[in-house]
């Protein structure tokens, strides 16, 4: 498999046919296919070299792992999606053993000194062919000459069959399956041929693709694949719930943010809860997991404006939710990204001198931002889009908090809300999902760059429009949402969460 | 300045209870964990668990989860390790240390000078 | 539970030396390690938490590094008032466990 391993060192080879027997629309097709590969290892921020080749008679190279310019996804991405299927009309016939030696050459090393660190390169060829060679000879050989310079299968002891891997699409009207099966690596329990149905899928294609075990601490990252669970797709969320005796208890989310920590709203506890009567589950798990203690933001008080005639003040409503185990990360247990830290910088793939302002901006520009909450509907986890009102819409939409249960003598909407808030809700741009109560303490989320990112959590709406359990279709232009904007509370965030090793900015 | 202080040593026979204590100053004793630690010739240095002064969650090593019991009192700053019945095995010197701040994970930053308790018949 | 194994269990030294001791921890405990000094009749005393951190008001002569399970305490000039036994111990994961101990003698 590709082990997309930050740390390590990796060179994949695009290998495009673009013969005549494969024709524009599948070309075009298998390209688009290469584009969403590239894009899918670069959310790992893993940053391999690429080598680029297309072929029919001849083969071109368009991108050589030498270049400085072949470990940049973005450039990568563009020389691929300026190659046209035109470009090899005039000879188009089906050398695809040429179009190996092409790789061959980016491989091997001048004067025959193997550079240092060779061996510790894992390599990685994608051909996209109908198997349909018919000039040049038999390309398997080329394969067993790249197999031999790289020492793979040679020493018993260390046979380093993981250091490459040959996969086959393929594509086209008509596909010689006995050609395309012999080109591809045969490895116990792991695919390396897969068909133009399956490109419908890319996500499941790129589950059997990618080994992500040195990559499961990266925060906001999901796995899409039609097999997967709830949890695979938000694999942060958590699920809160407070038993208190003859009160009967209070539904709340969260999300996962570190090994030990989960974020939520400070107002789904009072001070009164005991750490056992708090039950945190993760992943879809079953069993609940025990809390050590819930630290409050300090400025939080719901009854801090009550001589002022407000009866709930939801000001710096977060809370964190410290577990007494560490949680053990998988494909359904994985942290979120917190505004200004490394991995998030990491995540956006911004320079390594990214301000904590630059990420502001680049997640909360002030204009109208598309954002996503998960909710719990009918026993499955589902995203809603929204967008915050960040821009002009701004004022109108935080206006909208008097027609709030008790605010609505409020002389001055500051008073509750404060700039701790960000809102979501009402008909424009779009008509937003709003929260129910239920979704408090979950995270409003960034989704940028194949990534996910926490800006804000979850606090109090303006209507309940999830009446009786069900969310209500119509509801009026007034119910908005108010989350805790995230930035606004990070120096509480970065005290808390300094031993888990995120890396404030 | 941050202090530690313990009750004084015990000698005890097998069977009997005790508790001893551990009061801090020189901080808020609400806002850190209070460790209990003890150490033999035999065996070294052995956490045996810890209390949160502020809520009384407390925690143990499972290895003594049936042998002592944590406690505090947050109104006079004050930690306590208690025995129902002692055993010749109990003898040991024991050590109330604070822990990081409730939330972080920090080691034991000022212990307190040590109780020695001997269990004999 | 995780256990922590030290080496050497003891050691000779002058005064000026430079000292490393090691600990090794049965799992990962990402960066997690402390290591204490104890003189006799004392309470141990913190050096260093996080694997590397220096605690307030200890000597710079003292640091810490490593992370994952391989860990160590180096002295870089040994001092009179630095023979005495040092433990490491992870604050990873409950139970916090210890090392059995380093003995640092006069040679």
């Known amino acids: 498999k590709i082990v997309l391993d930050p740390s390590g060192s990796m060179n994949i080879y695009l290998v495009l046919d673009g013969s005549d027997s494969i024709g524009a629309s599948n070309f075009t097709g298998a390209k688009k296919c290469l584009v969403n590969l590239i894009e899918k290892v670069a959310s790992y921020g893993v940053k391999p070299r690429y080598g680029l080749v297309t072929y029919a008679t001849y083969p071109k190279i368009w991108v050589k792992v030498s270049e400085a310019d072949s470990s940049n996804a973005d450039w990568v991405t563009k020389q691929l999606n300026e190659i046209n299927y035109e470009d090899h009309k005039l000879k188009s016939g089906t050398n695809t053993k040429k179009a190996l030696q092409a790789v061959y050459s980016m491989m091997s090393w001048p004067d025959d000194v193997p550079p240092e660190g060779w061996n510790r390169t894992r390599h990685v060829i994608i051909l996209m062919t109908d198997g349909l060679h018919n000039m040049g000879g038999d390309p398997i050989t080329v394969i067993d000459e790249i197999r031999d310079l790289l020492y793979i299968g040679k020493d018993r002891k260390n046979p380093r069959e993981d250091y490459l891997d040959v996969y086959v699409f393929g594509v086209g009207p008509l596909v010689n399956q006995v050609n395309i099966n012999a080109l591809a690596s045969k490895k116990d329990n792991e695919q390396h041929v897969f068909k133009v149905k399956d490109m419908e899928n890319l996500e499941d294609v790129f589950y059997q693709m990618i080994d992500e075990s040195q990559s499961l601490s990266l925060c906001g990252m999901v796995w899409e694949h039609r097999k997967g669970t709830d949890y695979h797709k938000q694999p942060w969320q958590a699920k809160i719930s407070v038993i208190r005796p003859s009160k009967g208890h209070e539904s709340c989310m969260g999300a996962v943010v570190s090994e030990y920590f989960v974020l939520t709203a400070a107002h789904c506890f009072t001070v009164d809860d005991k750490e056992h009567s708090i039950k945190v589950s993760v992943g879809g798990e079953k069993r609940d997991l025990e809390i050590e203690v819930v630290l409050f933001h300090p400025n939080y008080n719901i009854n801090g404006k009550k001589e002022a005639g407000i009866p709930e003040f939801y000001d710096y409503d977060v809370a964190l939710i410290k577990l007494k185990n560490k949680l053990k990360y998988g494909q359904t247990i994985r942290p979120i990204c917190l505004p200004c830290t490394e991995g998030t910088t990491r995540a956006l793939r911004l320079p390594p001198t990214t301000t904590c302002q630059q990420q502001k901006e680049e997640l909360l520009p002030a204009q109208d931002i598309k954002a996503l909450f998960v909710s719990e509907e009918e026993k499955k986890l589902t995203r809603k889009e929204v967008y915050i009102k960040n821009g002009d819409k701004k004022g109108s939409c935080e206006r909208d908090a008097q027609y709030a249960p008790g605010y609505d003598k409020v002389k001055d909407i500051s008073e509750v809300v404060t700039p701790r808030f960000l809102c979501t809700g009402g008909v424009s741009p779009y008509a937003d999902p709003n929260t129910c109560r239920g979704d408090s303490g979950g995270p409003l989320i960034v989704h940028k760059r194949s990534r996910f990112i926490q800006v804000g959590v979850i606090s109090w709406g303006v209507v309940d429009v999830c009446k009786n359990q069900k969310r209500q279709k119509q509801v009026p232009a007034h119910a908005r949402d108010f989350h805790i904007n995230l930035f606004q509370v990070l120096p509480w965030l970065k005290e808390k969460l300094q031993d888990e090793d995120l890396g404030f900015l | 300045e941050v202090q530690l202080v313990q009750s004084g040593a015990e000698v005890k026979k097998p069977g009997e209870s005790l508790r001893i204590s551990c009061k801090g100053s020189?901080?808020?004793?609400?806002?850190?964990?209070i460790h209990w630690i003890r150490q033999s010739p035999s065996r070294g240095l052995e956490w045996l668990g810890y209390?949160?002064?502020?809520?009384?969650?407390?925690d143990y090593n499972q290895k003594f989860k049936d042998r002592v019991t944590i406690s505090a009192d947050k109104s006079i700053s004050t930690a306590y390790l208690q025995w129902s019945s002692l055993k010749a095995s109990d003898t040991a010197m024991y050590y109330c240390a604070r822990g990081g701040q409730l939330g972080l994970r920090r080691a034991m930053d000022y212990w307190g000078q040590g109780t020695l308790v001997t269990v004999s018949s | 539970d995780i256990q922590m194994t030290q080496s050497p269990s003891s050691l000779s030294a002058s005064v000026g030396d430079r000292v490393t001791i090691t600990c090794r921890a049965s799992k990962s405990i990402s960066k997690y390690l402390a290591w204490y000094q104890q003189k006799p009749g004392k309470a141990p005393k913190l050096l260093i938490y996080s694997g590397s951190t220096l605690q307030s008001g200890v000597p710079s002569r003292f640091s810490g590094s490593g992370s994952g399970t391989e860990f160590t305490l180096t002295i870089s000039s040994l001092q009179s008032e630095d023979f005495a036994v040092y433990y490491c111990?992870?604050?990873?994961?409950?139970?916090?466990?210890f090392g059995q101990g380093t003995k640092v003698e006069i040679k």
């Open positions: 209390i949160n002064p502020n809520t009384g969650y407390n």
């Open positions: 111990q992870q604050h990873d994961e409950y139970p916090w466990t």
């Open positions: 020189g901080y808020t004793f609400t806002n850190y964990w």
